[in-house]
């Protein structure tokens, strides 16, 4: 849905001065029903990496066919291999279902680099370690696709939690989510913990590997450190947000804080990295440069094509600025901000250079439709998409990668004035926000 | 335009170290877009990466040499310089220094190397 | 480790002749590769970078293609100056450490 590295395709103005703090509204937010404790379950039901997706378990049909699902917070659509492929290990076999109904009706999503096509239809749907219930859902089997599957991913779908507004093949067609919670007494609201493995690993390792919990229905306080903050969700079609504004090592990049959310910013767990503006990448890139002056690397690094590696162990942390993104928050003048390390923007690539390296990728990288808070921030916190209240919290993830100086932090309140303005308002046309 | 210029001594005993510079001239060492490197390679053998520096004194080494290697750099005079320490004969080269431009990833330009013999 | 293999070893040819020199990667490095030529007790000297890209002051026949994993140099017709031998270097893994083993283009 996003261009450049978006999975599965491979990849305001500052206002009062930050010491000036407001009280917060609660400490803590009431207890509701199912909403909060533990969810034992579903803890660790994540597998993958930042590089290729985080995918979950899930079982369609009857009887149950078990596929791995890729979690995407940034489309609409369940949609699941249903043909042979060179990259699947298995594919959804309607035939096989007796539940199976053909909704006589085809799909097609095209990105900028590839597509997927399919047909739909709607069969029983389940999460082996999800919540206890199934649900009759709507899924696009696809029967076409280019450049949409990853070799060795090991998914074989992808699972749009997002809102039906950017369902395709229209906003009538109803997502996944919204099933689960019309058909169950399932709350509206789920979280994730992306786990980043904050070290290249080889392919049985991924296999092998945790990577991360998708709390449905609620949220477990073992996944986070410290304070859940909220921000608003600005309109319900991505996870659309407000930043305010955004600073490298403590320093503001004193942009106008329409361009960090021009034409939009999303929360979106189907992209590999944190994509901004043109302009706002100029000016990120230029001061993470000059931050880490006393190096100099290659210009396809910053573009993050050239990988660079160091002796193992020796990778120098220190010398990378930590970002901090300014969200707007849920009381009036208030902002508060998410802070990541290099530890999340620099993401370890399977060791190409030889066994005593830790190679890396410069993980942030530049949009034309807007700033995308993808993996390399979801790594750092847990994230919670609060439907039922529309608004998106954040928490330090308790399985963040850091070092003995620095961690990533979620702080606040601030004083951000006029932060309304901060939002871009996108002309209405009947274009595709996938061909973007 | 510029140039680059090895020196030091052509041998070398086993064991010993051993010392060569690389004097920069009609450009400034401290420019910050390129880094400073050496390059060897054996009589009749391919090259092989050495090392190299920026003018902060930031260096990067090949991991295969590193334990042995010190590579320096003196803005004041323009020059960098390469240190190979416990050498034996599997170290007779010819030692080139070069310069590593576009994008800090080509050796764009090179020195003409020195010949250093390790024998006792 | 990447590494990259260049072929034939040798290569005999005559002046005017068309030369295909290729260097293979054992993984992709993109287009992040170099060529380089080295003529009897000279240095090295930069031909053509980022695969395709001619370096300052290098002749028109000299020309470069390929990404990923192989990647060819391209001499369209061999003028005397020309037998040498000629290196591949890849700098997709940075440091930018790695050369090919090179190939010989002699006189016929």
């Known amino acids: 849905t996003q261009h450049g590295i978006r999975l599965p395709l491979r990849s305001g103005l500052g206002g009062a001065p930050l010491g000036l703090r407001l009280p917060r509204e609660t400490d803590e937010e009431p207890e509701e029903p199912g909403r909060r404790g533990s969810f034992v379950e579903m803890v660790d039901n994540l597998r993958g990496k930042s590089g290729q997706g985080y995918y979950v378990e899930m079982t369609v049909g009857s009887p149950p066919q078990t596929l791995n699902i890729l979690v995407d917070t940034g489309s609409s659509n369940f949609a699941v291999g249903a043909a042979p492929h060179p990259f699947l290990h298995r594919y959804y076999q309607r035939q096989l279902s007796s539940t199976y109904r053909d909704l006589r009706k085809g799909v097609y999503v095209p990105y900028t680099q590839g597509k997927w096509e399919g047909e739909l239809g709607t069969d029983l749907v389940s999460i082996p370690h999800g919540p206890n219930v199934t649900v009759r859902a709507n899924i696009a089997a696809i029967t076409e696709s280019d450049k949409f599957f990853i070799n060795g991913s090991n998914w074989e779908g992808i699972l749009g939690l997002a809102y039906a507004e950017i369902a395709r093949p229209d906003d009538s067609l109803e997502p996944f989510f919204d099933s689960l919670v019309k058909q169950t007494h399932v709350p509206n609201l789920f979280s994730l913990q992306l786990c980043g493995a904050g070290f290249p690993l080889n392919q049985s390792e991924v296999l092998a590997s945790v990577g991360g919990s998708m709390i449905i229905g609620g949220i477990d306080h073992s996944l986070y450190t410290g304070s859940l903050w909220y921000t608003p969700i600005r309109r319900e079609w991505y996870y659309e947000v407000i930043i305010v504004r955004v600073e490298i090592n403590g320093q503001d990049l004193k942009m106008d804080c329409k361009e960090y959310n021009y034409d939009k910013s999303i929360v979106d767990s189907g992209t590999t990295n944190l994509r901004l503006p043109k302009k706002v990448f100029e000016a990120a890139v230029k001061s993470i440069k000059a931050a880490s002056s006393t190096e100099k690397f290659p210009d396809g690094f910053w573009l993050g094509e050239q990988l660079v590696c160091w002796q193992a162990g020796t990778t120098p942390w220190n010398i990378f600025p930590v970002i901090s993104l300014y969200l707007m928050g849920e009381v009036t003048n208030q902002s508060f901000r998410i802070t990541i390390l290099p530890q999340q923007y620099l993401r370890p690539v399977e060791d190409v250079a030889t066994s005593q390296d830790d190679c890396y990728k410069f993980a942030i990288s530049q949009s034309s439709t807007g700033t995308v808070m993808g993996a390399v921030i979801m790594e750092g916190f847990y994230v919670v998409f609060d439907r039922a209240r529309k608004r998106i919290g954040f928490a330090v993830s308790a399985c963040h990668v850091h070092d003995e100086f620095r961690t990533a932090a979620v702080e606040g309140p601030f004083v951000t004035l006029d932060m309304e303005d901060c939002g871009y308002n996108i002309p209405q046309t009947d274009e595709s926000t996938l061909m973007t | 335009q510029l140039q680059l210029q090895e020196s030091g001594p052509g041998l070398v005993k086993p064991s010993e170290t051993l010392s060569l510079t690389c004097t920069v001239s009609g450009g400034s060492i401290s420019r910050g877009s390129y880094y400073w490197g050496w390059i060897r390679q054996p009589p009749g053998k391919g090259l092989e990466w050495i090392g190299m520096?920026?003018?902060?004194?930031?260096?990067w080494y090949n991991p295969s040499l590193k334990s042995r290697v010190t590579i320096s750099v003196d803005t004041s005079k323009n020059q960098f310089s390469l240190k190979l320490s416990s050498v034996t004969a599997a170290d007779t080269a010819v030692y080139y220094c070069?310069?590593?431009?576009?994008?800090?990833?080509?050796?764009?330009?090179w020195g003409r190397g020195t010949l250093v013999t390790v024998s006792s | 480790e990447i590494v990259l293999t260049q072929s034939p070893a040798t290569l005999s040819l005559s002046p005017g002749e068309r030369a295909t020199l290729s260097c293979r990667a054992s993984?992709?490095?993109?287009?992040?590769l170099a060529w380089y030529q080295q003529k009897p007790g000279q240095a090295p000297r930069l031909l053509i970078y980022?695969?395709?890209n001619r370096a300052t002051g290098i002749p028109a026949r000299f020309s470069g293609s390929g990404s990923g994993t192989d990647f060819t140099l391209t001499i369209s017709s061999l003028e005397p100056e020309d037998f040498a031998v000629y290196y591949c270097?890849?700098?997709?893994?940075?440091?930018?450490?790695?050369f090919g083993g090179g190939t010989k283009v002699e006189i016929k």
């Open positions: 270097q890849q700098a997709y893994v940075w440091p930018p450490r790695t």
């Open positions: 070069a310069r590593v431009g576009h994008g800090v990833s080509y050796f764009d330009l």
């Open positions: 980022d695969a395709s």
């Open positions: 520096i920026y003018y902060s004194g930031s260096t």
């Open positions: 993984q992709s490095v993109s287009s992040y």
